[in-house]
């Protein structure tokens, strides 16, 4: 057999479909790899050939298009299952060829089972709704092309095991599910079941998505730096460890990149000839507002370091802010007096770091250690 441009296994398209449901799978060649569409290829005399490799097998086999009731068929660049079976799982290849040209790509297809509450290994798309924002809708996804517009399917929406009926603020409206006003209690998995007739048979399409209720843009504010602040002074003696936390609150903003960074004397810590460690932790509220903490640490601070300017900066789509930490060299107390309030700098640091933990509650911490020399 002559050479064929083999695009390999396209694992980016990890296609998952439910057992015993129709599935229409487009050949990825025309979607991602070739600069022309199926119609152009077909009119140029190219033929689309399908074959597959079963799960846990190495043998490539032709697809059997002569099954009862045309269970598997091909229509233009689409491979149809009406319906799928569990053992249809495998790697499928579509090959476009004529006597002088050949191009092919393989992709994995996984047929998955669901339980009576629609739980399954299926990866779920996430749809974000703004909290208390007014009417918002989600739409039953990926049902185009399964039935003609003349067919009127029945659509039933579920939240987990339960049909959505008589809900306070959620109304099924055909392919759409309307949230009159979204609350945290609306977080969860929503399933639409689309039932339609075809050639005297009834088919079901099940689509589940995760709804996540997030902070509303109405309530969004620029980043808020909680620490450093004017109430805490970082007073250190040379040789001690200097720890300064920068704790920043970010309102949830769709597709916003939240950034926190330190500057020392106006430069990035990388560009300063001192041994600085920055540890970052991130936690999220239930509405995906974010608290980022970057703790700047100098293990053995020098008197020069204590004269430097330490500024925490934060940026989001809502704006940029900065706050300087008040850092001082501790003046040793006279030998003959009892040590007074001047000795509480270390406690302040500990209290400040502790406060971060309290503020973040049960949040997840991701620690990144950046050593700057």
């Amino acid at each position: 057999s002559e050479r064929c441009d083999d695009w390999g296994l396209d694992t980016m398209r990890q296609i998952q479909v439910f057992e015993d449901e129709p599935a229409r799978i487009k050949c990825p060649l025309f979607e991602h790899f070739l600069k022309f569409n199926y119609s152009t290829a077909h009119s140029a005399g190219l033929t689309l050939i399908w074959y597959w490799t079963r799960q846990d097998r190495d043998l490539e086999e032709p697809i059997n298009f002569r099954l009862p009731e045309n269970r598997i068929s091909k229509e233009k660049d689409v491979l149809w299952f009406r319906p799928t079976l569990l053992n249809d799982t495998g790697n499928y290849t579509c090959m476009l060829r004529n006597t002088t040209y050949c191009s092919k790509v393989a992709f994995p297809l996984e047929v998955v089972q669901k339980d009576s509450c629609f739980n399954s290994p299926m990866k779920l798309p996430v749809h974000k709704l703004y909290i208390e924002y007014g009417i918002q809708r989600i739409t039953c996804p990926n049902v185009d092309g399964y039935f003609p517009s003349s067919v009127k399917p029945t659509i039933t929406w579920y939240m987990g095991c339960y049909k959505i009926q008589n809900f306070n603020n959620v109304i099924p409206e055909g392919m759409n599910l309307s949230f009159l006003i979204a609350f945290i209690s609306n977080n969860g998995n929503y399933t639409c079941v689309v039932t339609y007739p075809e050639n005297g048979r009834t088919f079901h399409l099940t689509r589940t998505l995760t709804v996540k209720v997030v902070g509303s843009p109405k309530n969004a504010v620029p980043p808020v730096i909680h620490s450093p602040n004017d109430h805490v002074v970082y007073e250190k003696e040379p040789g001690e460890e200097l720890l300064i936390p920068c704790t920043v609150y970010f309102s949830f903003l769709m597709d916003s990149r939240n950034e926190v960074w330190w500057t020392i004397d106006g430069k990035k810590p990388d560009d300063i000839p001192i041994d600085v460690t920055i540890n970052e932790s991130i936690s999220h509220s239930r509405t995906e507002d974010e608290t980022r903490t970057q703790i700047l640490s100098i293990k053995k601070v020098t008197s020069e370091d204590l004269k430097r300017s330490y500024v925490c900066h934060a940026r989001s789509a809502k704006g940029e802010v900065a706050k300087a930490a008040t850092v001082k060299q501790k003046v040793p107390a006279p030998r003959y007096t009892v040590e007074g309030g001047g000795g509480t700098g270390g406690l302040n640091d500990i209290f400040e770091a502790q406060k971060i933990e309290w503020h973040e509650g049960g949040g997840h911490h991701h620690h990144h250690h950046h050593h700057h020399h």
């Epitope: 339980d115 739980n119 095991c161 339960y162 209690s185």
Partner: antibody
Framework: QVQLVQSGAEVKKPGSSVKVSCKAS????????IQWVRQAPGQGLEWMGY????????DYAQKFQGRVTITADESTSTAYMELSSLRSEDTAVYYC???????????????WGQGTLVTVSS | EIVMTQSPATLSVSPGERATLSCRAS??????LAWYQQKPGQAPRLLIY???TRATGIPARFSGSGSGTEFTLTISSLQSEDFAVYYC?????????FGQGTKVEIK
Amino acid sequence: QVQLVQSGAEVKKPGSSVKVSCKASGSPAEPYAIQWVRQAPGQGLEWMGYIIPSLGGYDYAQKFQGRVTITADESTSTAYMELSSLRSEDTAVYYCARGQTLYDAGRQFDIWGQGTLVTVSS
Amino acid sequence: EIVMTQSPATLSVSPGERATLSCRASQSVSSNLAWYQQKPGQAPRLLIYGASTRATGIPARFSGSGSGTEFTLTISSLQSEDFAVYYCQQYNNWPWTFGQGTKVEIK
């Protein structure tokens, strides 16, 4: 520890209504459903309906449609089952039950109330 | 609605013996079946769900099997506290329905 505590026994006349309460303690953060099941003396279990207190969703078994009303007061974590037009065959122990989430059908009757005996007699 | 039929209605077993209870569904319920135990004057208690998964705190002597329309609850060695009524319940289709129960009594 999640518990369901139901109201006390009731004696009712035929044609009247009864309202049984079910108070939940230690409620989970996410939505859950409260189920109502009844058991006539010496008989099996019969599902009546459910409510999802935080979302308001409810449904009733066909047999009880028009006679049963299930409600909930989220502020007190209490669900109520009201049965109207009572007849002698409604004499039964009425149970509430619940699970931890809306997503695990097998455990929707995970925790049960102690039951409320309703006697319908003239 | 799916009708659940349990057999036998009463099962007489000696302590230490094995008890096998059956439950049949009028149509396939896949593995969406639960078993409950009820003692006199008490609320039912969840034993098994998903046809074979033991609920929290349920002893290993209780086991469930089956799928589709035929299910079995087995108590490998009956203890005195196991004498009770056992119900199966399907949750594959609404309305969720219970069997009429099997009473396990001391022989």
